[in-house]
């Protein structure tokens, strides 16, 4: 049978027809529709949006569209007992209180159900004490405080600036340092780009703007009460004391107007160096406590949020494959937002909507993809990737046997400078080839390819003439598919110029000011960057679902494995005497990488030569490609992180957003010089080298000739 069974359109025309059907004007219209009211997870408004999307995907022509619901732990402020922070005098009187809400943006003054800024899953509590400024609250910031400056955070309330690392890691670090509360704030150094006005006159964060966000340390567990299993009708739920990843100390976020009031009184130690100073007109003293005149004043937190088991809804759409219906290519992004979701997530959801519409149009004309495409609108991403994780837990047996690829579709933009891609090495060549076929939307690159503008603006640090492609970390819905299940994954969006814009993320991230107007006025008035992202995401899905041979190149994995082995060996070489003393050798890992390289090369040669008209051999070769990512999964998981099972990549233990290579070895080596029992510590390094070497060798063997 033809690989293009059930279609009357030639393969080349299919992709062109699909891409030509994508329209910027539709993405704009969908974004407007999705951003007029808040769609907080667990609310009626978000349930209604789920039903609307279900209905529209059916109209667009998908074969089936179902809601998948779960009852998961969410967190909300107490409506009658607001959260705030005070400065109190020696008599306990509150002489300053932080704001209870963000001033609403123009045109939104009468919108109800805007959740006030809060740190989701903070426990309740009213701690009071002296303040310690801890910079970004990174691991290295606490090392600086405790080891170099001899400042003890035990029993203190710490204030940390947002940025650099995931907020949950900041809270975990503060807890480990003995803090009794955490205040998170947005410093203008990180969230106010020079020369740009604050919203509504520009895209910068105003002083009253605040970043919401969860502060969990789930490590891939999903719903905190049902780790490993779906939160369905008959689920057994842990007690709250046994829940996964919940913080143990109160946490609350504030804007820089309020932060100024807390930081301007700080005394104690001066900042250790300029990297600890932000852009406020305050000394950035570390503390503890306030200066002489104010030394009797304390800070008090008032946190009354509650954790509640609440129903959430994913929308799952299916476009059945004509030839290999049991092979799934998944395009998923979340629907829930903190408030209006102008960028996060609806700039992504609008793109998914238009991709579904385009696929539906082709299907109505008689076309079907070769493989099944699943479309997902995830719920409760903002509360810990809950919707995607619960669905994957429920469907794990199908996914691990049938999952070809997962393409993530959260925010389409975080800037308008160039493309940004994070993906498995298996997709490098797919991304390169696709972007060479797409037009660049960038000024000054008219008539040039996206590949060309991307490579010029974001060059690879290793390979000249190629663009930078980053490792997958976490903090988004691909996590369960890639880190737990080992399904090849990727993500793409338009980003800022990291060279000139040093702020973290985009300034209005997770604030009330993330509106439709923010995107339409300041980021992408013509929606040309959104369209480009739709073409990249949609094009990847199209190729993955429709190409006869899967568009994966295993040789690219070989290249990065060598690079990662070099990197981890370089880290270990900082301890040459210990390596000698404890007989630590990386030879097994380098040998495995060498074998992988040779076997991958031979596999690629066979891939060029085999008889593609033989459906059994075709399926066999494609299965070897599909299961290669799966081969990097260790069923036992990483130490103390059972749901991070990928041996080559995991979210950094110090920053969930960042990817770490050979994470087991990396974590075993981290701060090893401070370990109480060096023999045990180096024994664990050796064990992790063994696990990594075995896994790489085992993965290589999956590419060998089968008999």
């Amino acid at each position: 049978k033809s690989s293009n069974e059930a279609t009357n359109i030639t393969p080349k025309h299919n992709m062109k027809a699909f891409l030509d059907e994508l329209k910027a004007e539709n993405i704009k219209k969908f974004l407007y529709n999705f951003t007029q009211i808040p769609h907080l997870a667990g609310t009626e408004q978000n349930f209604q949006l789920a039903k609307q999307i279900q209905s529209q995907w059916k109209e667009f022509g998908l074969d089936s569209v179902e809601l998948a619901h779960y009852d998961v732990l969410l967190s909300y402020p107490n409506k009658t007992h607001p959260n705030y922070i005070s400065i109190i005098n020696e008599d306990g009187n509150e002489i300053f209180n932080t704001s209870l809400f963000e001033p609403p943006p123009p045109g939104y003054e009468n919108v109800s159900d805007i959740v006030p800024p809060f740190s989701a899953f903070s426990p309740q509590g009213m701690p009071e004490g002296d303040l310690v400024y801890v910079n970004y609250a990174r691991t290295e910031d606490f090392f600086k405080l405790e080891r170099d400056m001899k400042i003890n955070c035990s029993g203190k309330i710490v204030i940390a600036r947002y940025g650099k690392v995931f907020r949950g890691n900041k809270v975990k670090n503060a807890q480990l340092a003995g803090a009794k509360g955490v205040i998170l704030y947005s410093d203008p150094a990180d969230y106010f780009a020079p020369g740009v006005k604050s919203y509504p006159d520009g895209w910068n964060l105003p002083g009253g703007g605040v970043q919401r966000g969860n502060i969990l340390n789930l490590n891939g567990a999903g719903d905190p009460l049902t780790p490993g299993y779906p939160a369905n009708e008959y689920a057994y739920r842990r007690g709250i004391a046994e829940a996964v990843g919940l913080p143990s100390i109160p946490v609350h976020p504030i804007g820089y107007y309020d932060a100024q009031k807390l930081l301007e009184k700080m005394g104690g130690s001066a900042p250790p160096d300029s990297s600890w100073r932000g852009s406020l007109k305050v000394p950035y003293n570390v503390g503890p406590g306030f200066t002489g005149n104010f030394s009797t004043q304390k800070v008090k937190m008032h946190i009354h949020s509650t954790n509640e088991v609440t129903r959430i809804y994913n929308v799952i759409g299916t476009l059945r494959g004509a030839v290999e219906p049991d092979r799934y290519v998944i395009l998923g992004g979340h629907r829930d937002s903190w408030v209006f979701g102008g960028i996060d997530p609806q700039s992504g959801a609008a793109v998914v909507h238009e991709i579904v519409r385009s696929f539906g149009t082709l299907k109505k004309e008689g076309w079907r993809p070769r493989r099944t495409i699943l479309f997902a609108s995830w719920d409760a991403e903002e509360f810990g990737l809950l919707g995607s994780t619960e669905w994957a837990e429920e469907n794990s047996r199908l996914l691990q046997e049938r999952g070809v690829a997962y393409i993530n579709a959260d925010s389409s933009i975080e800037g308008n400078y160039t493309l940004r891609v994070d993906c498995t090495p298996l997709m490098y060549s797919l991304v390169h080839n696709l972007t060479k076929e797409l037009k660049s939307p960038d000024e000054g690159f008219e008539g040039k390819s996206l590949y060309e503008s991307w490579t010029k603006k974001s060059p690879s640090p290793e390979f000249s003439g190629m663009p930078r492609i980053s490792k997958l970390g976490s903090g988004n819905d691909f996590e369960v598919f890639f880190q737990r299940l080992g399904i090849a994954s990727g993500r793409a969006r338009y980003t800022k110029n990291w060279e000139t814009n040093k702020f973290s993320g985009y300034p209005l991230y997770h604030s009330v000011y993330e509106t439709y107007e923010l995107v339409e006025k300041f980021y992408d008035p013509m929606f040309k960057y959104h369209l480009t992202v739709a073409q990249v995401r949609g094009g990847m899905v199209f190729e993955l679902a429709n190409s006869i041979v899967l568009p994966f190149d295993c040789r690219d994995y070989a290249v990065v494995l060598r690079k990662y082995a070099d990197k981890i060996y370089s880290i270990s070489m900082k301890h040459p005497q210990e390596m000698k003393t404890y007989s630590v050798s990386f030879d097994s890992l380098f040998s495995a990488v060498k074998n992988f390289t040779e076997i991958a090369s031979k596999f690629s040669e066979r891939l060029q030569d085999f008889d593609k008209s033989n459906p059994i051999v075709l399926r066999m070769m494609n299965d070897q490609l599909m299961f290669l990512e799966r081969a990097f999964i260790d069923p036992l998981g990483l130490p103390d992180r059972p749901f991070y099972r990928h041996v080559i990549y995991a979210p950094s233990s110090h920053n969930k957003y960042a990817g770490e290579s050979f994470p087991g070895i990396y974590d075993a080596l981290f701060d090893i010089e401070s370990k109480v029992d060096p023999s045990k510590a180096w024994g664990e390094v050796k064990r992790q080298i063994y696990v990594a070497a075995f896994t790489v060798q085992a993965a290589a063997e999956t590419l060998s000739e089968v008999a």
């Epitope: 640090p461 060598r562 370089s570």
Partner: nanobody, 118 residues
Framework: EVQLVESGGGMVQPGRSLRLSCAAS????????MHWIRQAPGKGLEWVAT????????EYVDSVKGRFAVSRDNAKNTLYLQMDSLRAEDTATYYC???????????WGLGTLVTVSS
């Protein structure tokens, strides 16, 4: 055959400078990170510096930061260590270490002795 050969060591007074070289042969030098390791008389091995593939990224042990600079010339297959403001405690045999694709085990040079003494 994969080989690393250090040179440039010698006796020097405190405060003066020396430049060590390490010539690589038998492998694609530009593809790999390279390291300088030292061993003071009667002491254990100590990492000094690492330079990554393209030469744009390097790292140093705290005790030499601001005084030593590692560099590489990929065209000449050579690694360098510029040592300024030398101190008595820098006295050691300096080894150049790398890994080559042809070799599973790390490759060490024979070392070059640096003696800092007044």
């Amino acid at each position: 055959e994969v080989q690393l050969v250090e040179s440039g060591g010698g006796m020097v007074q405190p405060g003066r400078s020396l430049r060590l070289s390490c010539a690589a042969s038998g492998f694609t030098f530009s593809s790999y990170a390279m390291h300088w390791i030292r061993q003071a008389p009667g002491k254990g091995l100590e990492w000094v510096a690492t330079i990554y593939q393209d030469g744009s990224e390097s790292e140093y042990v705290d005790s030499v930061k601001g005084r030593f600079a590692v560099s590489r010339d990929n065209a000449k297959n050579t690694l360098y260590l510029q040592m300024d403001s030398l101190r008595a405690e820098d006295t050691a045999t300096y080894y150049c270490v790398g890994r080559a694709s042809a070799s599973i085990t790390p490759v060490w040079g024979l070392g070059t002795l640096v003696t800092v003494s007044s």
